[in-house]
């Protein structure tokens, strides 16, 4: 019993530095508690962007200072990452863990390449 995780290959962040994507997993069991982690891979360095554990049927709760927000619907998680700048461009990987009840299952997506373009500063206007 394998757990497959699907996510889009590419997402372009908005001019306000917001990127959203769906992380979908094929659950091999009847999990009631799921943990979702977003990992960023850039230049062979891996950093944890955010993580949330949620009960099936309930909302995801990220820490107050997290740059992520999200909603869940069945085996689908809608993730939004805010405050992105050009330097944050990279591969964002969705890791899903079925925490309860046992057995535990792990699933890792192939990653979503998020491109962030810093907006051009507005030119001073002379009136």
């Amino acid at each position: 019993k394998a757990m497959h995780v699907a996510q889009p290959a590419v997402v372009l962040a908005s001019s306000r530095g917001i990127a959203s994507f769906v992380c979908e997993y094929a659950s091999p069991g009847k999990a009631t508690e799921v943990r979702v982690t977003v990992l960023r891979q850039a230049d062979s360095q891996v950093t944890e962007v955010c993580a949330a554990t949620y009960m099936m049927g309930n909302e995801l709760t990220f820490l107050d200072d997290s740059i992520c927000t999200g909603t869940s619907s069945g085996n689908q998680v809608n993730l939004t990452i805010q405050g992105l700048r050009a330097m944050d461009t990279g591969l964002y990987i969705c890791k899903v863990e079925l925490m309860y009840p046992p057995p535990y299952y792990l699933g890792i997506g192939n990653g979503t390449q998020i491109y962030v373009i810093d907006p051009e500063p507005c030119p001073d206007s002379d009136f």
Partner: antibody
Framework: QVQLVESGGGVVQPGRSLRLSCAAS????????MHWVRQAPGKGLEWVAV????????HYADSVEGRFTLSRDNSKNTLYLQMNSLRAEDTAVYYC????????????WGQGTLVTVSS | EIVLTQSPGTLSLSPGERATLSCRAS???????LAWYQQKPGQAPRLLIY???SRATGIPDRFSGSGSGTDFTLTISRLEPEDFAVYYC?????????FGPGTKVDIK
């Protein structure tokens, strides 16, 4: 740097209890799955148990379920394995190990502590 | 429970030779969630490979992993004197996390 140091091993009679400790430094326990793996003398490796992230979820091998209990003290960054109703077949070196970023492979291990169950 | 079988049980080779170790799973190991460890007498195991083919930090490039599904291989391209040890594979796609029985690489 990451370091794991186990303690609490020793000789104990069958049916008795023992508590192992694993002091972690160089990282925060709650960011990782923390595992115990054991190795009987001259034998291979056997996964024993894991305590996940916030400490609410714990999973155990069938061979220790109901007898062993995992806990954690975040203020001391220390992991504990309470072993009750010990049997001769629990005799082993017990290793504390940290789960990796990409899953439950074990990227850092302690030096191990020997538990001998004998009358 | 996923049962891992390793072969051969013992591999007798000389320094400089190539070592090929096999790990077979009783059922498919999802997304190649397989790791390899090296253990020397009196020491804790050391992570060599995770994700079937990714080398752990500080591991020399003479160690390489390959495979998917149920068949995995650890290759040591040229054995150094310090490579003679016992090697274990482990799956971590689902609990209980299981190890193979090990392959001992000793000096011929």
């Amino acid at each position: 740097q990451v370091q794991l140091v186990e303690s609490g091993g020793g000789v104990v009679q069958p049916g008795r209890s023992l508590r192992l400790s694993c002091a972690a430094s160089g990282f925060t326990l709650s960011n990782y799955g923390m595992h115990w793996v054991r190795q009987a003398p001259g034998k291979g490796l056997e996964w024993v148990a894991v305590i996940w992230y916030d400490g609410r979820n714990k999973h155990y091998a069938d061979s220790v379920e109901g007898r062993f209990t995992l806990s954690r003290d975040n203020s001391k960054n220390t992991l504990y394995l309470q072993m009750n109703s010990l049997r001769a077949e629990d005799t082993a070196v017990y290793y504390c190990a940290r789960g990796g970023v990409w899953g439950s492979y074990f990227d850092y291990w302690g030096q191990g502590t020997l538990v001998t169950v004998s009358s | 429970e996923i049962v891992l079988t390793q072969s051969p049980g013992t591999l007798s080779l000389s320094p400089g030779e190539r070592a090929t170790l096999s790990c077979r799973a009783s059922q498919s190991v999802s997304s190649s969630y397989l790791a390899w460890y090296q253990q020397k007498p009196g020491q804790a195991p050391r992570l060599l490979i995770y994700g079937a083919s990714s080398r752990a930090t500080g591991i020399p490039d003479r160690f390489s992993g390959s495979g998917s599904g149920t068949d995995f291989t650890l290759t040591i391209s040229r054995l150094e004197p310090e490579d003679f040890a016992v090697y274990y594979c482990q799956q971590y796609g689902s609990s209980p996390f299981t190890f193979g029985p090990g392959t001992k690489v000793d000096i011929k």
